[in-house]
């Protein structure tokens, strides 16, 4: 804002040429200029204090008049060089000059280190017009200080392209010591050293640091800041903070709680989220790490049967995500199954166990000795096998699916029957004559169908042909199936 | 009384030149910037620049720099505009103003105005 | 460059009325605005300076508000002598810019 004061001295809220915005304040002019027929010298108007103008920032502009008339020289009046005050307070400080009006066009603006204050609204021009003199205060404001308030503060006006500058003003905010640098909390091995860091700023210097350990004080003598404790070891949790003393008091830093890492707690709620035939999805809940970060997490599993040599199939995956697929298991088996993970220390105990079961599988094998004849009196096709092992048919048969494929003159046909689970035989009729058939068999369970058995084919010729021999899956290690007629 | 006296209207013909005074009174003339104003038939304002009086330095906004200058007389207490080759765009009225202080860019104090006619 | 924009061309009024005149900067003027009254064949007379203050001997029925880019004339009870073009003028920065003016007519 800007105060304009004529002869009456009537202020008037103004704009100042540099600073956008206003801020009404108090706009009592500090001088009303007497009326002057001549030019008058700087000294008849000093607001801040009595002083000669000085004449490190004289401004003594190149450019003259037609008559070459040089413009006098211009300067701002000294002021206050530097203000001390506390956090908080408000401070008001200004600079002020007086401008002959045959410079005619003039603006004024705030910097502070070196930057401009753009859109200050705490600052206030008061400008007082005579015939001769226009006299001009540019005040500044802060209401409440804080520390980045700190700096080197001028004033600059810009005339006829020629730049005048304050003296500059040092405005330094003193309050209780500041801490750019806190202990931090830390999880550390028992016994073992460790270093806290603890550093505050004035203004006022110096800043003394006290260290505490648990509400009590670590050093009889106080250390500059910055300072570094070194702690031979801790065999239990302790509290650290420091205290920051400076001619204006005293600062605490937080509080920092240093950890003594131990091995974690096992993990809780092991739980199964998903089973198939050979796999079993588990996740868990970890438990409390120790103060030091989780490594890896080992699975253990051993079969549940109490038949079983009792085992332990181990399986070791990353901590995270708390969850893992244990593959490789059989079929329709009960497992036990516990958690344990590990951190910088060592092992968790094992969880809690859980039981879990996979669930029926498809038989891992085919039916064995596939057999496969002509009945020509009936016009079938005979077939028989044995079936697959116990053990391998990863869960209860349910039957048997039957693959026959015809071929004939390049047309090809597949047909496929069920048959259940009692039998080891069954019989298909002919479906074309003088045609190659193709036997598969696989034997199913409620987990799916199994793999089918190596073909076994048989020549059915046209009718009226006589006596033909069965054809047979060969026994393990034999050659290919062959058609025998 | 503070007074700007404007010369009269001017007819002229493309490429010619003009001159126009504003004489100012009733206060100290080195004392106050002198700004002029064009105003086109119809038109708004638009500032052409000023003139320190005391240095006699110049300002020309962008739209009037080559063919528009300013000069003074200070013991008369004038100001002139000068327009050189002249063309119909050029007619208006033009206006001195009187700049209201060191620190202020308003204009506090008007000329009457000058009509320049072109016309071939 | 700054601009001025006087949004109504024309504005029309009767004696006694309350009339508002506004005008917007293209960016941020302060409170470095002026109103300028100006009636045909006659200068413009000043009437408002930084924005709000009156210039000595204008009625006290012209008042000037605003700051930053939005501004506005209002002249309580319109007299006769009133009617005329309007014109605001920002002096924050050079080139010092016109807006394109407002006439205030009888309805």
């Known amino acids: 804002a800007i105060t304009e004061a004529r002869e009456e001295a009537k202020p008037y809220p103004l704009f100042p040429g540099p600073f956008p915005g206003s801020l009404q304040t108090d706009h009592t002019p500090l001088l009303s200029l007497p009326h002057a027929s001549g030019y008058q010298p700087a000294l008849m108007f000093s607001p801040t204090q009595p002083g000669r103008p000085h004449t490190g920032n004289v401004a003594i502009p190149q450019v003259t008049s037609v008559e070459s008339k040089p413009l006098p020289p211009l300067a701002f009046k000294h002021t206050v060089g530097h203000i001390i005050l506390s956090e908080h307070k408000g401070v008001k400080f200004n600079c002020s000059i007086s401008v002959p009006n045959i410079y005619q066009d003039t603006t004024i603006s705030w910097w502070k280190d070196g930057k401009e204050l753009l859109g200050a609204h705490h600052a206030i021009t008061q400008f007082y017009p005579d015939d001769e003199v226009t006299a001009i205060i540019a005040s500044f404001s802060i209401t409440s200080v804080q520390r980045s308030d700190n700096g080197s503060y001028i004033c600059k006006m810009k005339i006829n392209n020629e730049e005048i500058v304050s003296d500059p003003i040092y405005i330094e905010v003193q309050g209780l010591p500041h801490f750019t640098k806190q202990p931090e909390s830390m999880n550390v091995t028992r016994n073992t050293a460790f270093n806290l860091t603890c550093q505050a700023v004035g203004p006022p210097e110096p800043v003394n640091i006290f260290w505490v350990q648990n509400s009590s004080r670590v050093n009889e003598q106080p250390e500059k800041s910055p300072s570094v404790l070194t702690v031979p070891g801790l065999t239990e949790m302790a509290v650290f903070s420091c205290e920051a003393h400076n001619d204006k008091g005293l600062t605490v830093s937080k509080g920092v709680q240093i950890n003594i890492k131990a091995i974690p707690s096992p993990p809780t709620e092991v739980s199964i989220r998903n089973s198939t035939a050979h796999s079993i999805l588990i996740s868990w809940v970890p438990g409390f790490d120790g103060y030091s970060p989780f490594r890896n997490c080992s699975i253990q599993v051993k079969e549940a049967d109490p038949l079983s040599n009792g085992s332990v199939m181990i399986f070791n995956t990353s901590a995270l995500p708390h969850l893992y697929q244990i593959k490789q298991l059989q079929a329709l088996a009960n497992y036990s199954i516990g958690v344990s993970c590990m951190n910088e220390i060592g092992w968790s105990a094992v969880s809690p166990w859980i039981l879990a079961s996979t669930t029926e599988g498809a038989p891992s094998v085919a039916p064995l000795n596939v057999t496969v004849f002509l009945n020509e009196s009936s016009d079938n096709v005979d077939i028989r096998w044995m079936k697959p092992p116990t053990k391998q048919q990863d869960g209860e048969l349910v039957g048997y699916r039957i693959s026959h494929v015809w071929q004939s003159a390049g047309i090809s046909k597949e047909l496929l029957e069920e048959v259940g689970q009692n039998g080891s035989r069954a019989r298909i009729s002919v479906q074309v004559h003088n045609a190659t058939c193709t036997v598969r068999i696989a034997a199913v369970t409620r987990g799916g169908v199994g793999p089918f058995s190596d073909p076994v084919k048989i020549f059915i010729p046209a009718h009226g042909w006589v006596d033909y021999a069965p054809s047979s899956t060969p026994a393990p290690g034999n050659a290919d199936p062959v058609l025998i007629i | 009384q503070i007074q700007l006296v404007q010369s009269g209207p001017e007819l002229k013909k493309p490429g010619e030149t003009v001159k126009i005074s504003c004489k100012a009174s009733g206060y100290t003339f080195t004392n106050y910037g002198m700004n002029w104003v064009k105003q086109a038939p119809g038109k708004g304002l638009k500032w052409m620049g000023w003139i320190n009086t005391y240095t006699g330095e110049p300002t020309y906004a962008d739209d009037f720099k080559g063919r528009f200058v300013f000069s003074l007389e200070t013991s008369a207490s004038t100001a002139y505009l000068q327009i050189n080759n002249l063309k119909n765009e050029d007619m208006a009225t033009y206006f001195c103003a009187r700049k209201s202080t060191v620190v202020s860019r308003y204009f506090d104090v008007w000329g009457a105005g000058t009509t320049v006619t072109v016309s071939s | 460059d700054i601009v001025l924009t006087q949004s109504h061309k024309f504005m029309s009024t009767s004696v006694g009325d309350r009339v508002s005149i506004t005008c917007k900067a293209s960016?941020?003027?302060?409170?470095?605005v002026t109103w300028c009254q100006q009636k045909p064949g006659q200068p413009p007379k000043l009437l408002i300076y930084?924005?709000?203050t009156r210039h000595t001997g204008v009625p006290d029925r012209f008042t000037g508000s605003g700051s930053g880019t939005d501004f506005t004339l209002t002249i309580n009870n319109v007299q006769s002598e009133d009617l005329a073009d309007y014109f605001c003028?920002?002096?924050?920065?050079?080139?010092?810019?016109f807006g394109a003016g407002t006439k205030l007519e009888l309805k």
């Open positions: 003028q920002q002096y924050r920065s050079y080139p010092l810019t």
């Open positions: 930084w924005a709000s």
């Open positions: 960016q941020d003027v302060g409170d470095a």
